[in-house]
């Protein structure tokens, strides 16, 4: 399996919400000693390999915004924990799993990762993982809304 | 702040079969890995096997024939039983939750397990 | 399964001076190694995963470097409560393993 990240840049404006997106492609064992561990963490670049630091995210680490099931099961983080820092992550029977931050501060600004762990009991972990960044901009250059770059190519979308 | 506990005999007969209790409090069990280590006196960590969440189970192939973890999600504990134990099954049996594609990041404080007749 | 050989198995060092712990994998572990630091009567405490993630509320004087089968913990000036038995552990392969420990001793 891969993670795709449908936006590899994200640019929004201060006080916004924005919702960082991962999906999960290829196929999907979803066998009974089969399971997928999700989360979400920021790291920085300049290492030897993306996302390879794993830091958190407002205070909380990527063992705090784990999500858990098996194949394409819906799943949502520890509610209470997360939204007090402002932050939410989900998953979709679909294989998208996403975090929600609101109300960014220009703090919120840097490169976040993604991670899924295929854990196959009785073999081994197979570690997954997607980067994307976000800008937060404040003043008279910054956008209305969240504005994001495909992974692909440079042509922008507006999002609300 | 998650915390461990492990409870159980601190002395067992050989032949017979060590039994001890992890209880987590502070967090959920539903989630991660939940693991037993030991540790022999003086000597290295090994570790037992492990539960995850959802009821799959784990064991090190040198303790496999003997060893059985099983989770009780509403009392939020995990247990291990291990038969036919011998002298050298003398150790602390620590309890940990194992965090996947990271490590061991909350432990028990240990309970020490004699093996004697 | 995957030996971890850790090296020296004592180390004998001042309060301020540098410690340089070595751990070597029987085959390639790539960054799946962690290090936890043991004092007598007390479990283990992780120090470090992924080979240099430091855990929630460990000080900088640790880190962590390498990947494959040669790794290295270093504890960048001794403070006396790091003097405790350190070992680390794979977990790119099941069973996880553990090395045999390094004593780091007051000299």
């Known amino acids: 399996f891969k993670v795709a990240t449908p936006y590899s840049l994200y640019v929004c404006p201060e006080g916004q919400n924005v919702t960082l997106t991962c999906r999960l492609l290829g196929p999907v064992d979803k066998g009974h000693d089969v399971t997928f561990y999700k989360t979400w963490y920021r790291s920085s670049r300049g290492e030897v390999q993306t996302c390879s630091e794993r830091r958190p995210i407002r205070n909380l680490t990527f063992a705090d915004l784990h999500l858990h099931h098996g194949g394409h099961q819906a799943a949502n983080t520890s509610h209470d924990l997360a939204q007090r820092h402002g932050l939410e992550s989900a998953s979709d029977h679909h294989g998208n799993f996403s975090i929600t931050m609101r109300n960014l501060t220009l703090l919120d600004s840097g490169l976040y990762c993604c991670l899924v762990v295929e854990i196959r009991h009785h073999h081994s972990e197979h570690a997954v993982h997607g980067a994307m960044e976000l800008q937060v901009q404040t003043g008279k250059d910054a956008p209305s809304n969240c504005v994001v770059y495909p992974s692909s190519s440079q042509d922008s979308e507006n999002i609300t | 702040q998650v915390q461990l506990q492990e409870s159980g005999p601190g002395l067992v007969k050989p032949s017979e079969t060590l039994s001890l209790t992890c209880t987590v409090s502070?967090?959920?069990?539903?989630?991660?890995?939940w693991s037993w280590i030991r540790q022999p006196p003086g000597k290295g960590l090994e570790w037992i096997g492990y539960?995850?969440?959802?009821?799959?189970?784990n064991y090190n192939p040198s303790l496999k024939s003997r060893v059985t973890i099983s989770v009780d999600t509403s009392k939020s504990q995990f247990s291990l039983k291990l038969s036919s134990v011998t002298a050298a099954d003398t150790a602390v049996y620590y309890c940990a939750r194992d965090i996947p594609a990271s490590a061991f990041d909350i432990w028990g404080q240990g309970t020490m397990v004699i093996v004697s007749s | 399964e995957i030996v971890l050989t850790q090296s020296p198995a004592t180390l004998s060092l001042s309060p301020g001076e540098r410690a340089t712990l070595s751990c070597r994998a029987s085959?390639?572990?790539?960054?799946?190694l962690a290090w936890y630091q043991q004092k007598p009567g007390q479990a283990p405490r992780l120090l470090i995963y992924?080979?240099?993630n430091r855990a929630t509320g460990i000080p900088a004087r640790f880190s962590g470097s390498g990947s494959g089968t040669d790794f290295t913990l270093t504890i960048s000036s001794l403070e006396p409560e790091d003097f405790a038995v350190y070992y680390c552990q794979q977990r790119i392969n099941w069973p996880l393993t553990f090395g045999g420990g390094t004593k780091v001793e007051i000299k």
């Open positions: 085959q390639s572990v790539s960054y799946y």
């Open positions: 539960i995850y969440y959802s009821g799959s189970t």
């Open positions: 992924d080979a240099f």
């Open positions: 502070g967090g959920s069990i539903s989630s991660y890995y």
